[in-house]
């Protein structure tokens, strides 16, 4: 047959030759020839390549910079990149997690619907009727108003989304 114009999976075409790609974790040193195989070398410490490739340089592992609030969630290998996450109380600003910001707090009148993670911010919701939050917090949900009735008391001051009801003793009816 004549030299090929297309190659099999995990091969690439160069100089009319179908050469084997380098496996993940290795970089290309030299293309194959009529008489020799593709030559590959393992990536060095702190380097990786995560696909079958013909790259002549491995990629550097991501650096989880503590100054940006980052820490290592999963150490990189020759075939995988390092995965960063944020320190406690912080979350990533993007999917790539290149920097962190402090978790948002829910203001008074709002409660935490979903607590923040290393990759997502706090989700707040307004306290509905019958619930309140009187603090700025990244953890506190809206609390239900106190039930005066169960304490054999009456509502002296109505609750709001920021304050609890104030209960007091029932007025005695004088004869």
């Amino acid at each position: 047959p004549e030299p090929p114009t297309a190659c099999r999976e995990k091969q690439y075409l160069i100089n009319s030759q179908c050469c084997s790609l380098c496996q993940p974790g290795q970089k290309l040193v030299s293309d194959c020839t009529e008489f020799t195989e593709t030559e590959c070398l393992p990536c060095g410490e702190s380097e990786f390549l995560d696909t079958w490739n013909r790259e002549t340089h491995c990629h550097q592992h991501k650096y989880c910079d503590p100054n940006l609030g980052l820490r290592v969630q999963q150490k990189g290998t020759s075939e995988t990149d390092t995965i960063c996450t944020c320190e406690e109380g912080w979350h990533c600003t993007s999917e790539a997690c290149e920097s962190c910001v402090l978790h948002r707090s829910c203001s008074p009148g709002f409660g935490v619907k979903q607590i923040a993670t290393g990759v997502s911010d706090t989700i707040c919701e307004p306290c509905p009727v019958g619930f309140f939050s009187n603090v700025s917090s990244a953890f506190e949900k809206c609390h239900p108003w106190t039930s005066c009735e169960t304490k054999d008391l009456v509502v002296q001051q109505a609750g709001t989304n920021k304050t609890d009801v104030v209960c007091g003793p029932q007025d005695r009816l004088r004869a």
Epitope: D31, F35, T36
Partner: antibody, heavy 112, light 112 residues
């Protein structure tokens, strides 16, 4: 077009060292490929002697024991053969080759 | 070493007729990646060897399509579908899977 050209003395005395140089044009010997020396004694077949790779490392035919050295001069795009302690059995046409391209060959006679 | 045995050692063919040369290796020429580095060369009278076929079945650039190579493992064949006068010379197989590289002893093709 890749071209290879052998050069060196055509007559070497027994027990002396045979020295040949191959000048390559049209391709850098540091880019890729294995750069070989092959010989053909009169009326006989071809014998692979050894190669120097694009990265400068070598491989030799064990039949030549410790007599053979292949080196290179990258500034001149040349590679060289040295064969020590020669005898009449080393009389041959010597080729340098990339295997897809060959030099025209040079005849070396070992005689006193 | 991989010993390469060619048959026949000589061949006389009428122009236009086919010719076939066999090359057998004493060990498999398939490497761990599944590739086989078996090559065929023609050395015309007074010339250097020229590459015809590489990696068992791939024609080198400029080689007429009447030349074809086949085989696997230890058994390989070079076929000329219709011999022409210019095809005379000695045909060699060469394996470069294992070091040392080794040639077959050659098959001389003559025209009747």
């Amino acid at each position: 077009e890749v071209q290879l050209q052998e050069s060196g003395p055509g007559l070497v005395k027994p027990s002396e060292t045979l020295s040949l140089t191959c000048t390559v044009s049209g391709y850098s010997i540091t880019s890729n490929y294995y750069w070989n020396w092959i010989r053909q004694p009169p009326g006989k077949g071809l014998e692979w002697m050894g190669y120097i790779r694009y990265d400068g490392s070598n491989n030799y035919n064990p039949s030549l024991k410790n007599r053979i050295t292949i080196s290179r001069d990258t500034s001149k795009n040349q590679f060289s053969l040295k064969l020590s302690s020669v005898t009449a059995a080393d009389t041959a046409v010597y080729y340098c080759a990339r295997l897809d391209y060959w030099g025209q060959g040079t005849t070396v006679t070992v005689s006193s | 070493d991989a010993v390469m045995t060619q048959t026949p050692l000589s061949l006389s063919v009428t122009p236009g007729q086919p010719a076939s040369i066999s090359c057998r290796s004493s060990q498999s020429l398939e490497n761990t990646n599944g590739n086989t580095f078996l090559n065929w060369f023609l050395q015309k009278p007074g010339q250097s060897p020229q590459l015809l076929i590489y990696r068992v079945s791939n024609r080198f650039s400029g080689v007429p399509d009447r030349f074809s190579g086949s085989g696997s493992g230890t058994d390989f064949t070079l076929k000329i579908s219709r011999v022409e006068a210019e095809d005379v010379g000695v045909y060699f197989c060469l394996q470069v899977t294992h070091v040392p590289f080794t040639f077959g002893q050659g098959t001389k093709l003559e025209i009747k």
